[in-house]
């Protein structure tokens, strides 16, 4: 027997993190995002649940809605109408999928100081929102869209086709919510509140995934979800626009699909209102390398939306799929014709382009061996965007301003030198025309949120600096975090290493690789985190490494598209390469290397364990994909094509975890899955387990009854991390 190794952090003034700290969320941080209601005013929910109004210029602040009013209906969220006469209060939050939930809504009249009675909203509502002007309400109930001109008015029913699990109006079905829109809604008001655009998803022909939900009853109930797996029939999608000025005079008008898209299976990808009578729709072929942006105009004389061919802009990828994870959306300029958009340049780096007439004539606005990530706001004279340009670190995010009023446009980094050590990863929240903005820094130091003047970029005030967290971390021994790159052949891999306190290069440490590795993801980010792996380094003396291999984002298409049509190859290979490099560094105990991952990371960790290299002693896969045929069509096919003989069936079959069952014989494998996983179905782990049993390979497994892909219920999460900790400590011969 190998003697047990106990890691003792030296110096007893500070204590190590405990697993309890992590499970209790003791060291969680706060961010501050203003809820902008004008150019210089915003709302924010205080610690004690009052809704507070702030005016930056007059420095006035007051409670617009008291916590007692919130409490009276157990409200957890709110929304102010643009005319500031009403507030909706949201309660009875009931989660559905990743973004979707249902809730009960109450309308509070701020003028009268009472709840609106008469024509109360039905319950539960699937989505509700105010119009951008006034106080019209659109909401979705039982898959149909309703409209109220004022909160106390009777509703107009806009759609009648809605049917549970069959037809969805104004809300996405499962696959569109998760893999295309990343929202709980599929309706959009025009800027003046005249029109309401919405999508109808017809899932009538989609196969159903069914799984048991055990609950407390004598019999489990069955959850049925129309869920198109790779190659299956997809939702049929139509976009309509209704004139909310005449809901009973004019029916919803369908927006035509571009011919080149409609000729075969296609997706709707996003809708952007350009002006009160101009809308921009984005469509995508089922083979997701061709995207079409279509600009449509309202023809009042026809009561129709016209999308001329000369207002169709095609984006095509010849090396992979269109866009990053999603196809980028346009940021229109004031002329309501030209727009800015991020797409790959000739060198394969994603950059901002200015499109005035055709994509072919696009003017490249940013360039370099880095990527523009998001366009926040385009104003009359400025364009604000984020990128990872600064100092060449792909895992950083800084905010830049391009003065588009100048010729040539001048570029300024707004955040690069603000708090250089503390803050290297920013996002921002802008008032309507960017007169003011908030910067939210996520790290690598303690997160901090600040308010800035949109013209001078001057900091006006600190909104949240996490002082309490700073104080509570004073007596904690935190690990040291390094972000570096390693080279192998012609490839460069960025990695993050979390080193135990008092790390000594002359000693040997166990190594845990945490992997995600999915296409267009990024794990090596300059952000603050105190989580399970922080604890493992702090208390258990484990070195943690995260590596961004091929297929990960923001380092150019050559690196990103390397995995196209062959998932499960290079992602794994690059983790193995990194491990070998880490061993060469001299402080890793080769006998004690483990890998773990969740979801796509569970897939990669499983394949890495089954690589036959002998590098890993043990590993954990939580909710892993085991075959791309089992996963959602939109995702699987984006990166793998179709599972058909004349397309890519062969690699679909070759890239399964089950095909490598024999190779698990010499590793300790812990397989974990929630039985109510709507996303990566339990089927994936069931098939891995079956293959391992058939191969007579021993392994460990844990299921979490009625838990979804996040295994996030308090008790389950505690059990999960405790269980994984025991498994790892046993694997690394660390005593309890």
């Amino acid at each position: 027997l190998r003697p047990s190794r106990v890691y003792k952090p030296e110096g007893n003034t500070k204590r190590a993190l405990t697993l309890k700290d992590i499970l209790n969320g003791t060291f969680s941080y706060k961010t501050y995002f203003p809820n902008w209601i004008s150019e210089q005013e915003y709302l924010h929910q205080s610690e004690d649940d009052n809704i507070v109004f702030y005016n930056i210029e007059t420095r006035e602040s007051y409670i617009i809605l008291s916590n007692s009013t919130m409490k009276s209906v157990n409200a957890t969220d709110y929304g102010l109408s643009p005319d500031r006469q009403f507030v909706y209060l949201e309660s009875d939050y009931s989660k559905l999928w990743r973004y979707s939930y249902t809730a009960t809504y109450y309308i509070y009249d701020l003028q009268n100081g009472e709840f609106v009675r008469g024509y109360e909203l039905p319950r539960p509502i699937q989505y509700l929102c105010w119009s951008p002007v006034g106080s019209k309400l659109a909401y979705v109930y039982q898959n149909n869209i309703y409209l109220k001109q004022r909160p106390g008015d009777p509703p107009f029913q806009i759609t009648y086709t809605g049917r549970e699990n069959r037809i969805f109006n104004g809300i996405p079905d499962w696959v569109y919510e998760e893999e295309m829109l990343a929202t709980k809604y599929a309706l959009w008001w025009s800027p003046d509140g005249k029109f309401l655009a919405y999508v109808e998803f017809n899932d009538s022909d989609i196969p159903i995934i069914a799984y048991s939900y055990y609950g407390d009853g004598q019999y489990p109930r069955t959850i049925n979800i129309p869920y198109p797996k790779a190659g299956a029939k997809n939702p049929v999608v139509r976009v309509f626009i209704v004139d909310t000025t005449y809901p009973h005079h004019v029916g919803p008008m369908e927006v035509p699909v571009p011919e080149m898209i409609a000729s075969s299976d296609y997706y709707f990808s996003w809708l952007t209102w350009v002006s009160s009578e101009r809308v921009c729709l984005q469509w995508l072929k089922r083979v997701q390398n061709v995207s079409v942006l279509s600009i449509c105009d309202f023809r009042e004389d026809w009561h129709a939306w016209e999308c001329p061919k000369n207002q169709e802009h095609v984006e095509e990828s010849r090396t992979g799929w269109a866009g990053g994870f999603f196809v980028s959306t346009p940021a229109f300029s004031q002329d309501a014709t030209s727009y800015y958009k991020i797409f790959s340049d000739k060198d394969g780096y994603k950059h901002i382009h200015y499109i005035k007439d055709t994509v072919e004539n696009a003017i490249q606005i940013t360039s370099g061996k880095w990527e523009a990530i998001y366009i926040f706001r385009v104003t009359q004279d400025s364009l604000f965007y984020s990128s990872n340009e600064f100092e060449g670190y792909p895992g950083r995010r800084n905010i830049y301003r391009i003065s588009i009023g100048n010729s040539p446009p001048s570029k300024k980094c707004v955040t690069c030198h603000l708090r250089k050590e503390r803050c290297q990863y920013y996002t921002a929240s802008f008032s309507y025309k960017a007169k003011y903005y908030a910067l939210v820094c996520y790290g690598p130091g303690l997160p901090i949120s600040t308010l800035h003047d949109g013209r001078t970029d001057q900091e006006i005030q600190v909104l949240e600096e996490n002082k309490e967290l700073e104080n509570s971390l004073r007596n904690i021994q935190l690990p040291k975090v390094e972000i570096k790159k390693l080279k192998d052949g012609g490839l460069t891999f960025w990695y993050k290493m979390i080193l135990p306190p008092q790390f000594d290069r002359s000693k040997k440490y166990p190594l845990l690789i945490q992997v995600y590795g999915g296409p267009c993801s990024q794990s090596v980010k300059s952000v603050f985190a105190v989580n399970w792996i922080t604890y493992l380094a702090s208390k258990e003396g484990i070195v943690i490494a995260l590596v961004d291999g091929r297929g990960t984002a923001f380092q150019g298409d050559k690196f990103l598209h390397a995995v196209y049509r062959k998932l499960g190859v290079y992602e794994v290979e690059d983790q193995l390469t990194a491990v070998r490099k880490f061993i060469e560094m001299g402080f890793i105990d080769e006998e004690r290397i483990a890998i773990w991952g969740w979801s796509y990371g569970g897939y990669v960790s499983s394949l890495a364990l089954a690589s036959g290299t002998g590098l890993f002693k043990c590993g954990i896969a939580v909710a892993p994909v085991s075959s791309w045929e089992y996963y959602a069509s939109i995702y699987s096919e984006r990166f793998m094509g179709l599972p058909t003989k004349d397309d890519n069936l062969e690699h679909y079959k070759n890239s399964t975890v089950m095909a490598r069952a024999e190779y698990f014989r010499n590793v300790d494998y812990l397989l974990i899955h929630g039985t109510a996983d709507d996303n990566v179905h339990f089927q994936n782990s069931a098939q891995i387990a079956k293959a391992l049993v058939n191969a007579q390979v021993d392994f460990q497994a844990m299921w979490y009854s009625d838990q979804n892909h996040g295994i996030s219920s308090g008790r389950s999460q505690n059990h999960l991390y405790t269980h994984m900790t025991h498994f790892l400590k046993q694997c690394f011969s660390l005593s309890d």
Epitope: Q149, P154, P155, F156, Q157, H249, G251
Partner: antibody, heavy 125, light 107 residues
Framework: QVQLQQSGVEVKKPGASVTVSCRAS????????IHWVRQAPGQGFQWMGW????????HHAQDFQGRVAMTRDMSTDTVYMELTSLRSDDTAVYYC??????????????????WGQGTLVTVSS | EIVLTQSPSSVSASVGDRVTITCRAS??????LAWYQQKPGKAPKLLIY???SLQSGVPSRFSGSGSGTDFTLTISSLQPEDFATYYC?????????FGGGTKVEIK
């Protein structure tokens, strides 16, 4: 007082066209939609469409697509409804009716509060 | 389109009687319903709008109720001038549609 005065009886052959006029008086012509509704002998009502006199915008029911045209003359406060390619089943009394809601706030429906006296159109060979 | 079904199609009643006419919508229409009265050879006359609001100048013996799919027109005490045909009309969604009518006749 507020009223809508329609043109007189029409007899037409199949394939022909008919134009019915409706003159408004007693209120601001531009402020209210005018709808057209027909009633076949011994039958119920069929809504045909509307015109917004303020802007001349029209919209009609699918059943009449391509066959009906609604226009207005602001100088005489008159709206016109032309129905083409007449068939025998177009025989009906045609009514113009004022929408009680204002064109400025058309989303509240208060019913058709003023009707014309009706125009009988007979289509027969 | 939304179909409105009126019942009964005809009713015989005497002066002073309470008469109730129902209108059922094939789908929910909230309160967007109007009632009209039509006498032979005449244009219809608006009685009730928004399901229950009495049009000005209409006697208070007429009342409307209901929301969603089921609506009622009630004449509390029938008068000689009330013998006519009554129609409901929905305005929740395009196209606007009318019920088939209910004829109120003298018993």
């Amino acid at each position: 007082q507020v009223q809508l005065q329609q043109s007189g009886v029409e007899v037409k052959k199949p394939g022909a066209s008919v134009t019915v006029s409706c003159r408004a008086s007693g209120y601001s012509f531009a402020d209210h939609f005018i709808h057209w509704v027909r009633q076949a002998p011994g039958q119920g009502f069929q809504w045909m469409g509307w015109i917004n006199p303020n802007r001349g915008v029209t919209h009609h029911a699918q059943d009449f697509q391509g066959r009906v045209a609604m226009t207005r003359d602001m100088s005489t406060d008159t709206v016109y409804m032309e129905l083409t390619s007449l068939r025998s089943d177009d025989t009906a009394v045609y009514y113009c009716a004022r929408d009680a809601s204002l064109t400025a706030r058309p989303y509240y429906f208060y019913g058709f509060d003023v009707w014309g006296q009706g125009t009988l159109v007979t289509v027969s060979s | 389109e939304i179909v409105l079904t009126q019942s009964p199609s005809s009713v015989s009643a005497s002066v002073g009687d309470r008469v109730t006419i129902t209108c059922r919508a094939s789908q929910g229409i909230s309160s967007w319903l109007a009632w009209y009265q039509q006498k032979p050879g005449k244009a219809p006359k608006l009685l009730i709008y928004a399901a229950s609001s009495l049009q000005s100048g209409v006697p208070s013996r007429f009342s409307g109720s209901g929301s969603g799919t089921d609506f009622t027109l009630t004449i509390s005490s029938l008068q000689p001038e009330d013998f006519a045909t009554y129609y409901c009309q929905q305005a929740n969604s395009f196209p606007l549609t009318f019920g088939g009518g209910t004829k109120v006749e003298i018993k």
